[in-house]
């Protein structure tokens, strides 16, 4: 008797340890995306950005999916969202179609049942790039926090996307699950 | 036969509850660091800051460690890291060596086994202080999701350290665990 | 005897279910409040920002109070709190009562137990903002790990409030419980 | 790279001016120093300038010697009322990405000879 | 800030370890360089922020310290190691000198 429920005990104990390790990771998707600048769009129109990088140097993800551009949420959730965007511009890159640069991020959702487009967060500055310097920099950051279903879908826009800085501790975005919806 | 029941079960709730307790605190370090400005160098360059305070005001570490100016991962996982860096300066100061400035900062990752060190976020803007004015004041903030090891080293990094805000809500920088690496 | 300690292991593992998912969601209040432009002071001073969405689009509130104008902490923990605050100008609006403009935010924790109120996180800049420009734009950032008492209250102070963006996604404060205090 | 010129054999109190030419990055986001070295003596730092053409000097240079950049890819030393003391290999260094304690990259040096 | 090396020179036989130190008057934290110069050259960069190897730097060598108390160890030691070392310190700029005043490594 005393054996089996020893037995039961353990079985008690190692289906818990199963489930809570199983519930913690599932519990917790991430994602950080890098800029790929192989392929940004020119202009100072406002774009969105697809070209982002996963699974190399910095970026990860894990739980979330990305597609065609997307950061694709595949567990309800609370999630931290978060994005960080640097813009450069340098003499030698030729010369600033116009000094007065509106420099902008956008944090967009998709709802793909309900085709509509939602911003989440912007942040950014309007600039005086003059030409008397030959060397030109503004970051910006946002972050907050949110509730995403399945299946929606988060989306990087930009104004002057040409002027983004390429490297992967300048240009990205991310998200973190926080906690279930109730 | 049933006392003998409900005591294991005493026992698995007690230490599963134990187990729960240790393992959540366990798996939550975090730090919040603010400047120490009694010694701020001179300069434009880019200099790593090295005095922080991490037990007075706002300032507090848990299961991570600083030392020799560096915040120390105790423990493996992802942490959201975050960075938070003003400068300022008024004309009582004296006059700023020139107006072009660029006020920068760099959040590094320093690898101890394999002495290598990389930027991991990057924030700032150019900025041009005019003497017309007789205050100044810039801030940056970065944050971002990284995957930490313990032994792994977290510094700030800044360009022109002597137009650093000095205040405890202003210069901080600070990380906390998420979850666990699989 | 078996069937018993079934029964048990049943009332063990639904108990710990029980018991996970309740201190799980109570371990976790949050809010995102988004402003309430209806009710903007005018004047460039420094003002506390007391009309907050807490229900509506983006805003949401659990396990936390919204009154007064102030986000009030019901449980003790170690919460990240964040706010991006956007300024905005454009000639059509009439003209700036001064070119040179301090865009400041603080955020800041009351304890009412010992009446007192200090700033956590500060960020802003200072900005010129020229006639020769139709539009002007500018946001803030902050965030930051703090340990939070029951009955603390977070409140947001900008200065220019005339200049604040509407938007939901524009200006907005928030925070989440990441850990208990120990 | 970097290359450095101008040196030649002056007479004391006469002005000098050096140049350092770069090639291949930005002078905007690095710094660049001038360092000189005696005949048989070690490093001696003069200063350094970077983006805004905001220049730094070691205390004793201060007055004496001027940094600037003339051009997007050159830096001058401006050097007046020379001294026999100041006779040295002049060194134009890299500070890669504006760290000081990183200078990666250095010319060959250009020789100032002060002597009646 | 003042820079100040020892011992100088300093000798080490072929195969063994050379260690060299550095002390800054105030602390500078991890803001310090190592330097190699040979006769005729300028110097290369081996060490950047106390214990970070440069590219193209041998892994024989190491940077350790914080603060005021630096050390260059070089393991391995090679002829090709006979040098003068210089640290330099990247902290501020007020300072008379950056550099210490250099230790010379004769290889037995």
């Known amino acids: 008797g005393s054996q089996h429920i020893r037995a039961e005990k353990a079985m008690v104990d190692g289906s818990w340890l199963d489930l809570a390790k199983r519930s913690k990771l599932e519990a917790q998707p991430f994602a950080h995306l890098t800029i790929n600048a192989t392929d940004i769009p020119s202009g100072s129109h406002k774009v969105s950005l697809s070209s982002w990088y996963h699974d190399r140097g910095w970026a990860k993800i894990s739980n979330m999916t990305f597609s065609n551009g997307k950061l694709i949420v595949n567990q309800d959730g609370f999630y931290y969202l978060y994005a960080n965007i640097c813009f450069r511009h340098h003499e030698t890159s030729g010369d600033l179609a116009t000094e007065y640069l509106q420099l902008m991020v956008y944090v967009t959702k998709t709802s793909i049942k309900i085709p509509s487009s939602h911003t989440l967060m912007k942040g950014g500055s309007t600039k005086y790039w003059s030409g008397n310097s030959e060397f030109h920099f503004y970051s910006i950051n946002v972050g907050g926090f949110f509730k995403l279903r399945s299946g929606e879908e988060i989306s990087i826009e930009v104004s002057n996307p040409s002027l983004l800085d390429p490297d992967q501790d300048a240009t990205y975005f991310g998200a973190f699950k926080v906690r279930d919806i109730d | 036969g049933s006392q003998h029941i409900r005591a294991e079960k005493a026992m698995v709730d007690g230490s599963w509850l134990d187990l729960a307790k240790r393992s959540k605190l366990e798996a939550q370090p975090f730090a919040h660091l603010t400047i120490n400005a009694t010694d701020i160098p001179s300069g434009s360059h880019k200099v790593s800051l090295s005095s922080w305070y991490h037990d007075r005001g706002w300032a507090k570490i848990s299961n991570m460690t600083f030392s020799n100016g560096k915040l120390i991962v105790n423990q493996d996982g992802f942490y959201y890291l975050y960075a938070n860096i003003c400068f300022r300066h008024h004309e009582t100061s004296g006059d700023l060596a020139t107006e072009y400035l660029q006020l920068m900062v760099y959040v590094t990752k320093t690898s101890i086994k394999i002495p290598s060190s990389h930027t991991l976020m990057k924030g700032g803007s150019t900025k041009y202080w005019s003497g017309n004015s007789e205050f100044h004041f810039y801030s940056i903030n970065v944050g971002g999701f990284f995957k930490l090891r313990s032994g792994e080293e977290i510094s700030i990094e800044v360009s022109n350290p002597s137009l650093l805000d000095p205040d405890q809500d202003a210069t901080y920088f600070g990380a906390f665990k998420v979850r666990d690496i699989d | 005897g078996s069937q018993h300690i079934r029964a048990e292991k049943a009332m063990v593992d639904g108990s710990w279910l029980d018991l996970a998912k309740r201190s799980k969601l109570e371990a976790q209040p949050f809010a995102h409040l988004t402003i309430n432009a209806t009710d903007i002071p005018s004047g460039s001073h420094k003002v506390s920002l007391s009309s907050w969405y807490h229900d509506r689009g983006w805003a949401k509130i659990s396990n936390m109070t919204f009154s007064n104008g102030k986000l009030i902490v019901n449980q003790d923990g170690f919460y990240y709190l964040y706010a991006n605050i956007c300024f905005r100008h454009h000639e059509t609006s009439g003209d700036l009562a001064t070119e040179y403009l301090q865009l400041m935010v603080y955020v800041t924790k009351t304890s009412i137990k010992i009446p007192s109120s200090h700033t956590l996180m500060k960020g802003g800049s200072t900005k010129y903002w020229s006639g020769n420009s139709e539009f002007h734009f500018y946001s803030i950032n902050v965030g930051g790990f703090f340990k939070l008492r029951s009955g603390e209250e977070i409140s947001i102070e900008v200065s220019n409030p005339s200049l604040l963006d509407p938007d939901q996604d524009a200006t907005y404060f928030g925070a989440f419980k990441v850990r208990d205090i120990d | 790279s970097v290359e450095e010129s101008g040196g030649r054999l002056v007479t004391p109190g006469t002005p000098l001016t050096l140049t350092c030419t770069v090639s291949?990055?930005?002078?905007?986001?690095?710094?660049i120093n001038w360092v000189r070295q005696a005949p048989g003596k070690g490093l001696e730092w003069i200063g350094y300038?970077?983006?805004?053409?905001?220049a730094y000097y070691a205390n004793w240079a201060k007055g004496r010697f001027t940094i600037s950049q003339t051009s997007s890819t050159t830096v001058d030393l401006k050097m007046t009322s020379l001294t026999i003391e100041d006779t040295a290999t002049y060194f134009c260094?890299?500070?890669?990405?504006?760290?000081?304690?990183?200078?990666?990259?250095w010319g060959q040096g250009t020789l100032v000879t002060v002597s009646s | 800030i003042v820079m100040t090396q020892t011992p100088s020179p300093v000798s080490g036989a072929v195969g063994g370890t050379v260690t060299i130190n550095c002390q800054a008057s105030q602390s500078i934290g991890s803001n310090l360089a190592w330097y190699q110069q040979k006769p005729g050259q300028p110097p290369k960069l081996l060490i950047y922020?106390?214990?970070i190897l440069a590219s193209g730097a041998p892994s024989r060598v190491s940077g350790s310290g914080y603060g005021t108390e630096f050390t260059l160890t070089i393991s391995g030691v090679q002829c090709a190691d006979a040098a003068t070392y210089y640290c330099q310190q990247g902290y501020t700029t007020n300072a008379d000198n950056i550099f210490g005043g250099g230790t010379e490594v004769v290889v037995e």
């Open positions: 300038i970077n983006y805004g053409a905001s």
């Open positions: 260094a890299r500070g890669y990405g504006n760290d000081w304690d990183r200078l990666d990259l």
């Open positions: 291949g990055f930005s002078l905007y986001t690095n710094l």
């Open positions: 922020s106390a214990s």
